[in-house]
């Protein structure tokens, strides 16, 4: 066992001479992003104060390619890198095409409305006049491709004029536009060469040891890894922690059960019920508030102040009133919970599916005519599953090196 341990320690660290270095640099696992949209069935009725009705559409599946660049080894046992992602639509795996039309809330209009609720009435009336002149409405009918990767919207210019410096978009707006052909920030992580216990743990993200999106030191901490590999020799007492730039926070998953993936022993880690709980149910999350109902996390502070919320799909594990407020939601543990299956000896993921939902808080705002009589509601926009499983040559090599060889050596 000590020989095996030495082999593992030698080969998991981030070092060009280690077996897993190329795997770390160019992840050989095929990743897929499956997106499900909530098509709004009754936009006119919602504007009259009726309950929203949605229909899930999808999946729209994209192959996700990741590669690390600007890899720089530092002299404090860390390595810095940028990871770029590109997405390629997969028609054969999708239920529909990128040219499918979806009716969804106009995030720019409804988001701006909620953001301006406490602004002077004059500004709100000017916005109403502008929205009317520009033909901006509370709901929009856009293609999947436009919603994902961006569409030209004059409102982007308007928001940049009236709220300078707040909006990360220029000319075009898309929910996944910032992810495609771009990096998720500069990660500096420990290599494990000098101290294996810190391997893969994030030292800094974009030069920061902690973020400032939230209202408590604990919530602002950058904990765990960058979300791709973890320290080796896990036990059922281990937790799986990582910093997610998209969620602007660290997340901690808990051990659920042992399993086997293609002959390789794994530990399954899942989200605890407290992941998106509000501060009154789980006090450590108080720093993520102001909160609405439990089970959704307000990400407005890191999403250009728009009233956007992150949760499990279909408001799984959230306060039931959220799913009850929208017709067409059916939370289901099997379909909507996330998991990561990790090989505990190496800390390398074998099979994973991270599922999250993005929702918009919308309501009628006095002075913004486009909001009509909308009753306050957290309306799901879409949910996605980012999934990957080790396969082919990589899986064969992994099985041989880390399952077969140790068995042979053991005998």
């Amino acid at each position: 066992p000590s020989l095996i341990k030495q082999q593992v320690l030698k080969n998991v660290r981030i070092d060009p001479s280690s077996l897993s270095f190329n795997m770390w640099k160019e992840i050989p696992i095929p990743f897929y992003l499956s997106v499900y949209f909530f098509d709004v069935m009754n936009p006119s009725e919602i504007l009259k104060g009726e309950k929203p009705q949605v229909r899930e559409r999808g999946p729209y599946v994209y192959r996700e390619f990741r590669h690390k660049s600007n890899i720089t080894f530092n002299n404090n046992d860390t390595v810095s890198f940028l990871e770029y992602r590109t997405f390629q639509f997969q028609p054969s795996k999708s239920h529909g095409s990128e040219s499918d039309y979806i009716v969804m809330p106009n995030i720019l209009v409804l988001g701006a409305a909620v953001m301006m609720e406490n602004k002077p009435m004059t500004l709100k009336l000017i916005m109403t006049l502008a929205f009317t002149t520009l033909g901006e409405r509370a709901f929009m009918n856009r293609t999947v491709g436009e919603i994902m990767w961006g569409y030209k919207d004059p409102l982007v210019n308007l928001i940049n004029k009236y709220f300078p410096g707040m909006f990360p978009f220029k000319d075009k707006f898309g929910l996944f536009a910032e992810l495609n052909n771009s990096d998720s920030g500069l990660f500096t992580v420990f290599t494990g060469v000098q101290n294996i216990s810190r391997i893969h743990l994030v030292d800094k993200w974009n030069g920061l040891s902690k973020v400032d999106f939230w209202h408590s030191d604990q919530c602002n901490m950058i904990n765990g890894t960058s979300g791709q590999m973890w320290p080796p020799f896990m036990t059922p007492e281990s937790s799986l922690e990582f910093y997610s730039p998209e969620a602007c926070r660290s997340m901690k998953l808990m051990y659920k059960e042992s399993g086997v993936f293609e002959g390789i022993p794994t530990y399954r880690f899942v989200a605890p019920k407290t992941l998106f709980a509000n501060g009154s149910i789980y006090p450590p999350n108080e720093g993520f508030c102001p909160c609405l109902e439990s089970g959704i996390q307000n990400v407005s502070t890191c999403r250009f102040s728009a009233p956007l919320f992150l949760s499990h799909p279909h408001f799984l594990n959230a306060d039931p009133v959220l799913a009850e407020a929208v017709t067409g939601l059916h939370p289901n543990q099997e379909a909507h919970s996330l998991f990561l299956d990790i090989h505990p000896v190496t800390g390398i993921p074998m099979n994973c599916s991270v599922k999250l939902q993005l929702s918009l808080y919308m309501k009628s705002v006095a002075g913004i005519g486009q909001t009509g009589k909308i009753e306050p509601v957290v309306l799901p926009l879409l949910w996605f599953a980012e999934s990957g499983a080790m396969e082919g040559e990589t899986l064969h090599t992994f099985y041989t090196q880390l399952v077969l060889m140790p068995k042979v050596m053991h005998y």
């Epitope: 936009p43 006119s44 504007l47 009435m121 009336l125 000017i126 109403t128 006049l129 502008a130 009317t132 002149t133 520009l134 033909g135 901006e136 409405r137 509370a138 709901f139 004059p154 210019n157 308007l158 004029k161 006095a366 002075g367 005519g369 486009q370 009509g372 009589k373």
Partner: antibody
């Protein structure tokens, strides 16, 4: 479907004021913002101001600021536009308009009210 | 003077194609979408096109709109006698914090 019905033509002397009405029919008055526009002979329309009848909040174009007052009476489903200190250049057709919820641009207009300012 | 500039007149024979131009600046057409209104003689303006290239409800597909830089245009194909009217362009202007209109183009169907 919402319709806007305006009051009849008016003749005024310079320095006086005129008050035009715009009645909303066919739907709930307070669901619609009412916009007022001026169209001088042979020219394009010019936006003057707007009102949210729900809470009587208004804004006015800089050009008309101080001379125009837009009001609403929810008991009669009617919006009003009063223009004071009239000048001969104010001779024009005045329109109320709205945007039906979920539409774009000013897609519903009143028939217009001709105001002639002459000594 | 109107903020948006339109030629005062245009003409065409029935069945022909006519185009109206509307010139603005970076604070209006250059940054935002354009609406077009049709005003028949003695009537109120009627919304014809919104968000540059979208026809308003009930408008036939003979009408089309486009925009390039700080100019916009409206085209009518298969000209008909009932198209004889004034045509106004309009856009949001962020230096004036309001909508601005062109002076209008009078279309005569020959």
């Amino acid at each position: 479907e919402v319709q806007l019905v305006q009051s009849g033509a008016e003749v005024r002397k310079p320095g006086t004021a005129v008050k035009i009405s715009c009645k909303v029919a066919g739907d709930t008055f307070t669901d619609y913002f009412i916009y007022w526009l001026q169209q001088a002979p042979g020219k394009g329309p010019e936006w003057m101001g707007l009102i949210d009848p729900k809470d009587a909040q208004t804004i006015y174009a800089e050009k008309f600021q101080g001379r125009v007052a837009i009001t609403a009476d929810t008991s009669t489903d009617t919006a009003y536009m009063e223009l004071s200190s009239l000048k001969s250049e104010d001779t024009a057709v005045y329109y109320c308009a709205t945007d039906s919820v979920g539409s774009a641009g000013f897609d519903v207009w009143g028939q217009g009210t001709l105001v002639t300012v002459s000594s | 003077l109107p903020v948006l500039t339109q030629p005062p007149s245009a003409s065409g024979a029935p069945g022909q194609r006519v185009t109206f131009s509307c010139s603005g600046s970076g604070s209006n057409i250059g940054s935002y979408t354009v609406n077009w209104y049709q005003q028949l003689p003695g009537a109120a303006p009627r919304l014809l096109m919104h968000t540059t290239d979208q026809r308003a409800s009930g408008v036939p597909d003979r009408f089309s709109g486009s925009k390039s830089g700080t100019s916009a245009s409206l085209a009518i194909t298969g000209l008909q006698s009932e198209d004889e009217a004034d045509y106004f362009c309009a856009a949001w202007d962020d230096s004036l914090d309001g909508p601005v209109f062109g002076g209008g183009t009078k279309l005569t169907v020959l």
